[in-house]
């Protein structure tokens, strides 16, 4: 086919007829079909589900649709030998023990293969001894238990609320602090909303329900047995002792009923403060151990779960483009859920049904996107993002050369408030233009933009009159594209008021709880919400498959390098005779920042100004657009942390889910005034200013008029 | 040729506002940051306001924070200042300025005529 | 009170040189670039230097500028009565996310 016989792009078939065919209640009646049982990775459930999938993808006018499969390391409880955690007295009798599972919701009390609580791939053990309460185990805890407190959790069992960073990041913390286990446990102050019922009266989190999650430290690494590469049949496997970020030392969750039981009787030190403090009827003693009339009471835990090497299948269909085949702009979302994923993944998966139905229907008219569209539904995302990253290993030959974007497609909401937006710079100006097309949901806003109620309800803290956009962090499936790749990336969700939520994530988040009824009741019950999730995200997808010209602006990178130097340099300020002494200078990067800047604006009048009608040039302009992201790329990686390529963005050292801006100078500056050689330290420093500033001038250069 | 031309100006009561516009040719508008910048009667130059280029990220002096809004239109070539509250220290000239280097502001390669404002009861 | 601070008034006569000086902090002179404008009575500001000790085309060599840590001098040689005007520097503060100007210094060629 020649290009111009193949587009097909008429008035009819324009972003207008690609919105206008998603329906909120198809996305309804996929998330119900695909939450009546629960789809764990590695099992059977769920390779029928991808399989269904695949099918009706196929239906839905898709050019092509195949199963990718890999041998992954995962985790599961043993079957015949429950996990759980006891207080013992001094004769080793076992006078209290957690719960072996949750109470199932009504109507679902038959339904089989429920994985009870677990903290997926903790090692086996049967670690005993006294309490400390680490309240959310940051590393600022720590600093304040060690450091203030003069608190040692060597040998220790540590109590851990969850909330506000990553669980895997409180584990290590945990270890580097020498615990011997860990609980975690979710308090009433974080995950109990004031004046709401708790499930299934409301959307709170009842006492006996209990937060699952992975509790590794990959990095990026994808399959622990074979980072770098894919989990094929001819793969390399490690041995489990060199398997990557495997914790060390047991963990287990439970829920706030059973955490009284163990705080209640915490003794020694007061907690330091009422940050320290939660919702519970417990004094929030640090310990160590318990208080006078039980400090002869320890406490044992009984972990005996496996690892083990099991298949996964990830779902990825094709819609060709019809000038530019070789250009890729990606949908991926998971699939694979913990029990029945009301939320997390099912009403994300249910909009990437519904936007690949609707393309697929333009498809069946005749369109076809400029760029080639693929479609993805992941494995083993709560296992660690294996099935993402597994795919991006194997493609990532294709993936450097040929990925435009990346859109991201976990949990279509996590509130009904506002929407949430984390992306690349590039996307910026698209998110925002889209939006002001878009009609907002929220009451009150009726015949308005989702522009104006996002503004209104989550303003930029430092540019007015705009919403915020997030900086990407981790924690999803985008992160091989985005920090080990390049590819420019984005999410987006609705979202809790934050200022009157404080509870971290939403409440029922990875438990029994998180069911069908749970969204259709309380969260969206007429799926509109959910409807404008899938417009943007689908929006979006079809700008960047579409547009003639990349929809990227590099001035609005221009605008956060120069933001992020400021910020980097006001850090390094707090060191001013440092700074001095060791000759630390950020004259270079501020230069290079400038340089970008300069540039980027003269691209973007050449970008204006160039014969569009020439399909050379427009071809450049457009890779010059695409290559952008993937100049920030450093082949080396940051220090110790090798998945993780992006100079400009990483996932944060204390914090997974968080993005951190100028990262390799941001961890080489932390904690520096306790370096045992600061010398050392801050040579470090100076040589992360190098490489920042090497790498922000040469993503500067593939800007510059190539000849 | 770069021009900037700003208009709007005039005598306002304190509590008042007014809306300044800056209309601007010769350039590629979008690519560049624009600022606004005051000098009372007598007195220096003071920053009020700056807007991207890109998407129009804002920066504001601390002393009109919360009162003045900048924006453009980039498809008009034109850059405002929207006054609100305004108080007797507000009276000054304004003037546009384009800043040379691109996206964020540097320094001002280009400055316009400026406009009076004046706020008085 | 400006963030900048520079003398308010210099004066030498024709032909003579004479230097403004531009004194700031770490978080704006010290990392950030340095412009100075010339403001002749009745007009616009004029960008006179920048990025510290360039000059736009159109402004003769006679005028100069230069930095060290967190100060700036703008040098002026062979003084001419048409130099009688205000002077300005200015910079991006860094903590602050703003543009800064000093308070202006009004140069008088005597004579």
């Known amino acids: 086919k020649s290009s111009s016989e193949a587009t097909n792009i008429t008035p009819k078939h324009n972003m207008k007829a690609f919105l206008d065919e998603l329906k909120a209640e198809n996305i309804k009646k996929f998330l119900h079909n695909f939450t009546q049982i629960p789809h764990l990775a590695g099992t059977e459930q769920n390779f029928q589900l991808a399989k269904q999938i695949q099918s009706q993808w196929k239906e839905f006018g898709l050019d092509s649709v195949e199963l990718t499969h890999y041998d992954v390391l995962l985790s599961y409880p043993n079957k015949t030998h429950p996990n759980y955690i006891s207080i013992i007295n001094e004769d080793g009798n076992e006078i209290f023990n957690t719960s072996l599972f949750e109470p199932p919701p009504a109507g679902y009390e038959n339904v089989s293969d429920i994985v009870p609580p677990f903290s997926a791939f903790s090692p086996q053990g049967m670690p005993e001894g006294d309490l400390v309460y680490v309240n959310y185990a940051r590393t600022e805890d720590f600093f304040k238990l060690e450091r203030d407190m003069k608190i040692n959790c060597s040998g220790k069992i540590v109590i851990a609320r969850y909330g506000k960073v990553f669980r895997g990041n409180k584990v290590k913390n945990a270890q580097l602090a020498g615990a011997t286990g860990v609980i975690l446990y979710s308090d009433p102050a974080d995950y109990f909303a004031p004046g709401v019922k708790s499930y299934p009266d409301g959307w709170n989190l009842p006492g006996g329900g209990v937060q699952r999650g992975n509790i590794l430290n990959l990095n990026g690494a994808g399959d622990p047995l074979t980072p770098g590469y894919p989990a094929n049949e001819y793969a390399y496997r490690r041995g489990i002792a060199e398997a990557v970020g495997l914790p060390s030392i047991p963990v287990h969750p439970i829920g706030y009923y059973d955490a009284q039981k163990l705080l209640e009787k915490m003794g020694g030190s007061a907690s330091p403060d009422s940050s320290w403090r939660g919702s519970l009827k417990v004094p929030y003693n640090v310990g160590p151990g318990f208080t006078g009339n039980f400090s002869t009471q320890k406490v044992k835990m009984h972990i005996h779960s496996t690892s083990e090497v099991t298949r996964i299948y990830n779902v990825i269909g094709t819609l060709r483009g019809a000038v530019e085949p070789d250009r890729y702009v990606i949908l991926g979302g998971h699939r694979d859920s913990w029990v029945f994923g009301g939320i997390d993944p099912q009403s994300g998966a249910a909009v990437v049904h519904e936007i690949v139905r609707s393309f697929g229907t333009l498809k069946k008219e005749g369109w076809r996107p400029r760029r080639t569209i693929l479609f993805a539904s992941w494995d083993a995302e709560e296992f660690g993002l294996l099935g993402s990253t597994e795919w991006a290993e194997e493609n990532s030959r294709l993936l450097q050369e040929r990925g435009v974007a990346y859109i991201n497609a976990d949990s279509s909401i996590e509130g009904n408030y506002t929407l949430r937006v984390d992306c690349t710079p590039l996307m910026y100006s698209l998110v925002y233009n889209l939006t002001k097309e878009l009609e907002s949901p929220d009451e009150g806003f009726e015949g308005k933009s989702l522009y104006e109620s996002w503004t209104k309800k989550s303003p930029s803290p430092e540019f007015s009159g705009m919403p915020r956009i997030s900086k990407l962090g981790s924690g999803n499936d985008f992160e091989v594209f985005f920090q080990r790749l390049g590819i420019a990336s984005g999410r987006a969700r609705y979202t809790k008021n934050w200022e009157t939520n404080k509870f971290s994530s939403y409440p029922l988040y990875h438990s029994v709880y998180e069911t069908y009824e749970l969204v259709e009741k309380f969260y969206d019950p007429m799926f509109k919400y959910h409807l404008t999730v899938a417009q943007v995200r689908g929006g979006m997808v079809f700008e960047l498959a579409n547009s003639v010209v990349l929809p990227f602006d590099c001035r609005d990178y221009a605008v956060v390098l120069r933001k992020y130097a400021d910020k980097i340099y006001n850090i390094s300020m707090k060191h001013p005779q440092e700074m001095k002494t060791y000759s630390v200078s950020f004259d270079s990067l501020f230069s290079a920042v400038k340089n970008f800047t300069e540039i980027a604006s003269k691209f973007s009048e050449r970008l204006r100004d160039f014969d569009k009608s020439n399909p050379i040039l427009l071809r450049m302009m457009n890779d010059q657009l695409m290559f952008l992201e993937r100049a920030f790329i450093d082949p080396l990686g940051l220090p110790d942390r090798p998945f993780y390529r992006h100079v400009i963005y990483a996932p944060s050292s204390h914090n997974k889910y968080a993005g951190e801006s100028f990262p390799g100078i941001y961890d080489a500056l932390f904690d520096i005034e306790s370096k045992v050689d600061p010398s050392q330290a801050w040579g470090e420093v100076k040589r992360q200013i190098s490489i920042a500033t090497f790498t922000v001038q040469a993503a500067a250069e593939t800007l510059s008029e190539v000849a | 040729e770069v021009q900037l031309v700003e208009s709007g100006g005039g005598l306002v009561q304190p509590g008042g506002s007014l809306r300044l516009s800056c209309a601007a040719s010769g350039f590629t508008f979008s690519s560049y940051a624009m600022s606004w910048v005051r000098q009372a009667p007598g007195k220096g130059l003071e920053w009020v306001s700056a807007i991207s280029g890109g998407i129009g990220s804002t920066y504001y002096a601390d002393s009109v924070k919360g009162r003045f809004t900048i924006s453009r239109d980039n498809s008009k070539n034109t850059l405002w200042l929207q006054m609100n509250s305004l108080r007797a220290e507000d009276t000054a000239v304004y003037y546009c300025?384009?800043?040379?280097?691109?996206?964020?502001?540097?320094?001002?390669?280009?400055w316009g005529q400026g406009t009076l404002v004046t706020v008085s009861s | 009170q400006s963030v900048l601070t520079q003398p308010p008034s210099v004066s030498a006569a024709p032909g003579q040189k004479v230097t403004i000086s531009c004194s700031g902090s770490s978080s704006n002179i010290g990392i950030n670039y340095v412009s100075w404008y010339q403001q002749l009575p009745g007009t616009a500001p004029k960008l006179l230097i920048y990025?510290?000790?360039k000059r736009p085309s159109g402004i003769p060599d006679r005028f100069s500028g230069s930095k060290s840590g967190t100060s700036a001098t703008l040098g002026i040689t062979g003084l001419q009565t048409g130099d009688e005007a205000d002077y300005y520097c200015?910079?991006?503060?860094?903590?602050?996310?703003?543009?800064?100007f000093g308070g202006g210094t009004k140069l008088t060629v005597l004579g």
């Open positions: 300025a384009k800043d040379a280097v691109g996206a964020t502001p540097y320094y001002f390669d280009y």
């Open positions: 990025d510290n000790n």
């Open positions: 200015g910079t991006w503060d860094s903590s602050l996310s703003a543009v800064v």
